[in-house]
């Protein structure tokens, strides 16, 4: 039995690790699933952040794992992306859904960040150059669309390269190759890693490598 407290919990089950799998919510002491109507990257971002798996990788419209059972607690979940918990997102009401079945259980793939790397290249030292990120074993770049000093600040801090001195686009440090992992990132400058900034999803972009972004950090400028 329970004695009050917030009667809601969140978990991902039947995935490869605690940061992927079928979305399950515990409401009123009962675990249930979330229907995938209207499922979005914003909802996935909220879930990943809530579970301490801050990188939203993808939002499968159905759980890649086996179908769930029991109650379907949420449907038509609509998040802005900045909610602190999934149940702060709008939905149809608890236990209310439009004839969903467990074949429509929503799934999430986050990253715990342990398989991610970042580096700066072609800048003459480790603290300046083109931004490259290793994700799923492949090095790729970041598009310069809407890139600004807040993004640069996150990168410099993450790489322990001091503060951001400048940022550049238009492949100022040469064109990279491979995937373009990020486009239209939204950072406030306080994130602990670039992939914790709000984004559209890994590999989602409308760019080419002529738009690869770069930065110069204070420790890199000192070495120039």
């Amino acid at each position: 039995s329970s004695l009050g407290g917030t009667d809601k919990e969140l978990r991902l089950v039947d995935g490869e690790n605690k940061c992927s799998g079928r979305v399950e919510v515990k409401v009123q002491e009962e675990w249930g699933t979330v229907c995938n109507n209207g499922w979005s990257m914003e909802a996935v971002s909220v879930i990943c952040n809530q579970l301490g798996c801050p990188t939203a990788i993808k939002a499968p419209g159905w759980a890649n794992s086996s179908a769930g059972s029991g109650r379907i607690w949420m449907d038509h979940v609509s998040c802005r992306g900045n909610e602190s918990a999934l149940w702060d997102c709008k939905h149809d009401g608890w236990g209310k859904h439009s004839n969903c079945t467990h074949q429509q259980d929503a799934g999430v793939t986050c990253s715990d960040g342990s398989n991610l790397e970042m580096r700066l290249t072609r800048g003459g030292n480790m603290c300046s150059g083109r931004i490259e990120i290793k994700f799923q074993g492949r090095w790729g770049t970041v598009c310069d669309d809407n890139f600004n000093i807040d993004h640069a600040s996150v990168i410099c801090r993450q790489l322990e390269c001091g503060s951001a001195v400048s940022f550049s686009g238009s492949s100022n440090f040469g064109e990279g190759s491979g995937p373009i992992w990020f486009d239209d990132l939204i950072c406030n400058g306080n994130e602990s890693a670039l992939w914790n900034c709000k984004h559209q999803g890994w590999g989602k972009h409308n760019c080419d490598h002529a738009e690869d972004a770069g930065v110069i950090c204070s420790k890199g400028a000192d070495l120039s």
Epitope: S2, G5, D7, K8, E30, K90, G93, W94
Partner: antibody, heavy 116, light 107 residues
Framework: DVQLQESGPGLVKPSQSLSLTCTVT?????????WNWIRQFPGNKLEWMGF???????SYNPSLKSRISITRDTSKNQFFLQLNSVTTEDSATYYC?????????WGQGTTLTVSS | SIVMTQTPKFLLVSAGDRVTITCKAS??????VSWFQQKPGQSPKLLIY???NRYTGVPDRFTGSGYGTDFTFTISTVQAEDLAIYFC?????????FGGGTKLEIK
């Protein structure tokens, strides 16, 4: 359709235990829903007391601490409220209420007076 | 526990009037607010759940709105049969708590 009917003693002496029964018709209490007790004090203030789920899990209002117990008899399709060490402050109309999550279905209520 | 502060306590209106009742939560309850109607001598009945969703069979003159801490319940055109006490209630966290009620009287 779900129908709920409360029954109880009407009058209880202070320090005694209160036992109320909710008889459910038209629906099995093991099929679905949370089966709640809610009381309404004179002056109309409502207080959620606790529930027992269709699977038998219970949850209680912390304000009632260790005084409350909700149980059920599935063979009779009934669930019960026991409240120990009652005082005059427990005088109220007691409702049994059910629903998936929301308080959809209400009984008519039974009035309890605590008095010596 | 989350405290739900409901205003006003009493409303005296004429048939045909528009009525608004407000409920303020002591902390954010997201969209998780329900509204109930209790007619004299009856048990409460669910009118609105999840801020704005009308329960089955509830007339469309009853509406709800709000988010976070501030919520509103409106009867667009009051009818004589709407004489009742109206309660808000938060569904966000346990224990679920109710407002103190608004008694609606018809002139």
């Amino acid at each position: 359709d779900v129908q709920l009917q409360e029954s109880g003693p009407g009058l209880v002496k202070p320090s005694q235990s209160l036992s109320l029964t909710c008889t459910v018709t038209g629906y099995s209490i093991t099929s679905d829903y949370a089966w709640n007790w809610i009381r309404q004090f004179p002056g109309n203030k409502l207080e959620w007391m606790g529930f027992i789920s269709y699977s038998g899990i219970t949850s209680y209002n912390p304000s009632l601490k260790s005084r409350i117990s909700i149980t059920r008899d599935t063979s009779k399709n009934q669930f019960f409220l026991q409240l120990n060490s009652v005082t005059t402050e427990d005088s109220a109309t007691y409702y049994c209420v059910s629903g998936t999550y929301y308080f959809d279905y209400w009984g008519q209520g039974t009035t309890l007076t605590v008095s010596s | 526990s989350i405290v739900m502060t409901q205003t006003p306590k009493f409303l005296l209106v004429s048939a045909g009037d528009r009525v608004t009742i407000t409920c303020k939560a002591s902390q954010s309850v997201s969209h998780d607010v329900s509204w109930f109607q209790q007619k004299p001598g009856q048990s409460p009945k669910l009118l609105i759940y999840y801020t704005s969703n009308r329960y089955t069979g509830v007339p469309d003159r009853f509406t709800g709105s709000g988010y976070g801490t501030d919520f509103t319940f409106t009867i667009s055109t009051v009818q004589a049969e709407d004489l009742a006490i109206y309660f808000c209630q938060q569904d966000y966290s346990s224990p679920r708590t109710f407002g103190g009620g608004t008694k609606l009287e018809i002139k």
